[in-house]
């Protein structure tokens, strides 16, 4: 009686179970009563990443430099190429089809997490006692200067965008 289901890594064709092609190979011809499944390796810049019965291999992804992309990991016959973004850019989606520039943290905000090729900058507000006077994708909030440790006094209080201004003791009101 012909099988209705086949084992793992097999497929049903013409009422018989044939072996699937291994990753990195495509199907040339199905098995018969007398012959095994015929498979061929994928060509250069092609891949298949699963046990399959595909007659064509997939093309490796192209990391288009015009979109800010570069190769992070070169594809093999069994894996696709992985693209990432050039320095200063990050992917717009998980599949990384294009890139956009990293966001800068505005004055009054510091970098909480520096951007990577796949994630944008995360900013946080500078709390009291800290400041940032620049727009930057790298700088954290910096602490206000301690006038006391310099034997000076505060002449002007700091803000989230400006440092404290220190002055000599005798200038104190």
């Amino acid at each position: 009686e012909p099988p209705t289901a086949c084992r793992e890594k097999q497929y049903l064709i013409n009422s018989q179970c044939c072996s699937l092609c291994q990753p990195g190979q495509k199907l040339v011809s199905d098995c018969t009563e007398f012959t095994e499944t015929e498979c061929l390796p994928c060509g250069e810049s092609e891949f298949l990443d699963t046990w399959n019965r595909e007659t064509r291999c997939h093309q490796h992804k192209y990391c288009d430099p015009n979109l800010g992309l570069r190769v992070q990991q070169k594809g093999t016959s069994e894996t696709d190429t992985i693209c990432t973004c050039e320095e200063g850019l990050h992917c717009t989606s998980e599949s990384c089809e294009s890139c956009v520039p990293h966001r800068s943290c505005l004055p009054g905000f510091g970098v909480k997490q520096i951007a990577t090729g796949v994630s944008d900058t995360i900013c946080e507000p500078c709390p009291v006692g800290f400041f940032s006077n620049v727009s930057s994708a790298f700088e954290k909030c910096r602490p206000w200067t301690s006038c006391e440790t310099k034997d000076l006094v505060v002449q002007q209080a700091g803000t989230n965008k400006t440092d404290v201004v220190c002055g000599p003791q005798d200038r104190q009101r």
Epitope: G110, Q113, G129, F130, V153, Q172, R173
Partner: antibody
Framework: QVQLVQSGAEVKKPGSSVKVSCKAS????????IEWIRQAPGQCLEWMGS????????NYNQKFQGRVTITADTSTSTAYMELSSLRSEDTAVYYC???????????????WGQGTLVTVSS | DIQMTQSPSSVSASVGDRVTITCRAS????????????LAWYQQKPGKAPKLLIY???SLQSGVPSRFSGSGSGTDFTLTISSLQPEDFATYYC?????????FGCGTKVEIK
């Protein structure tokens, strides 16, 4: 020990101004922030503003900007909060409190004045 | 401005009870550089000024009984009284001091059941 002593209760007419004082002792007045907070009957605590007496630097709550003026006299270790254009909704207890002491590490209010009741009524 | 929301607005409890008060901020009060939480808790009794209990979300102010404790980070904070005493019946306020303007929660009144 740290002490903040405020001026007595006031009754004011709508449209007028009130000036509340807060005399500090037991710590270095010039290098510690004085904060002003108010509490209307049955309402939340509301921060109004602050001053660093040694420099005269101030911070104000935008809600009161233009109506509140905070000053300090280092020679008498006294801070003042003046609120102008009074209306009935300004009826509240006004508190001064000590804030950061120059360490940039103690912005919470560890000592409070006893409070000054300001009643605005025609 | 950072909004502070306290819950519940009141709680009835008996002496010896464990009481938990929560406070939620409209934005994170945890700063990544020093990992500090810019939050304080105060106790206020009728006709009196507020009294500092907890600062940096979990540090106990000197002289405050150890039955008071604070916890939390980011936007969610808790004040716990492990075993309520008669003198603890009061109103409790949270306050952030992350950035100006400082704001307070509207309080939780702990009443006798």
């Amino acid at each position: 020990q740290v002490q903040l002593v405020q001026s007595g209760a006031e009754v004011k007419k709508p449209g007028s101004s009130v000036k509340v004082s807060c005399k500090a002792s037991g710590y270095t007045f010039s290098t510690s922030w004085i904060e002003w907070i108010r509490q209307a009957p049955g309402q939340c605590l509301e921060w109004m503003g602050s001053i660093l007496p040694g420099s005269g630097s101030t911070n104000y709550n935008q809600k009161f900007q233009g109506r509140v003026t905070i000053t300090a006299d280092t020679s008498t270790s006294t801070a003042y909060m003046e609120l102008s254009s009074l209306r009935s909704e300004d009826t509240a207890v006004y508190y001064c409190a000590r804030g950061d002491d120059g360490s940039y590490n103690r912005w919470y209010f560890d000592h409070w004045g006893q409070g000054t009741l300001v009643t605005v009524s025609s | 401005d950072i909004q502070m929301t306290q819950s519940p607005s009141s709680v009835s409890a008996s002496v010896g009870d464990r009481v938990t008060i929560t406070c939620r901020a409209s934005q994170s009060l945890t700063f990544s550089v020093n990992q500090k939480n810019y939050l304080a808790w105060y106790q206020q009794k009728p006709g009196k000024a507020p009294k500092l209990l907890i600062y940096w979300a979990s540090s106990l102010q000197s002289g405050v009984p150890s039955r008071f404790s604070g916890s939390g980070s980011g936007t969610d904070f808790t004040l716990t009284i492990s075993s309520l005493q008669p003198e603890d019946f009061a109103t409790y306020y949270c306050q952030h001091y992350y950035s100006y303007p400082w704001t307070f929660g509207c309080g939780t009144k702990v009443e006798i059941k």
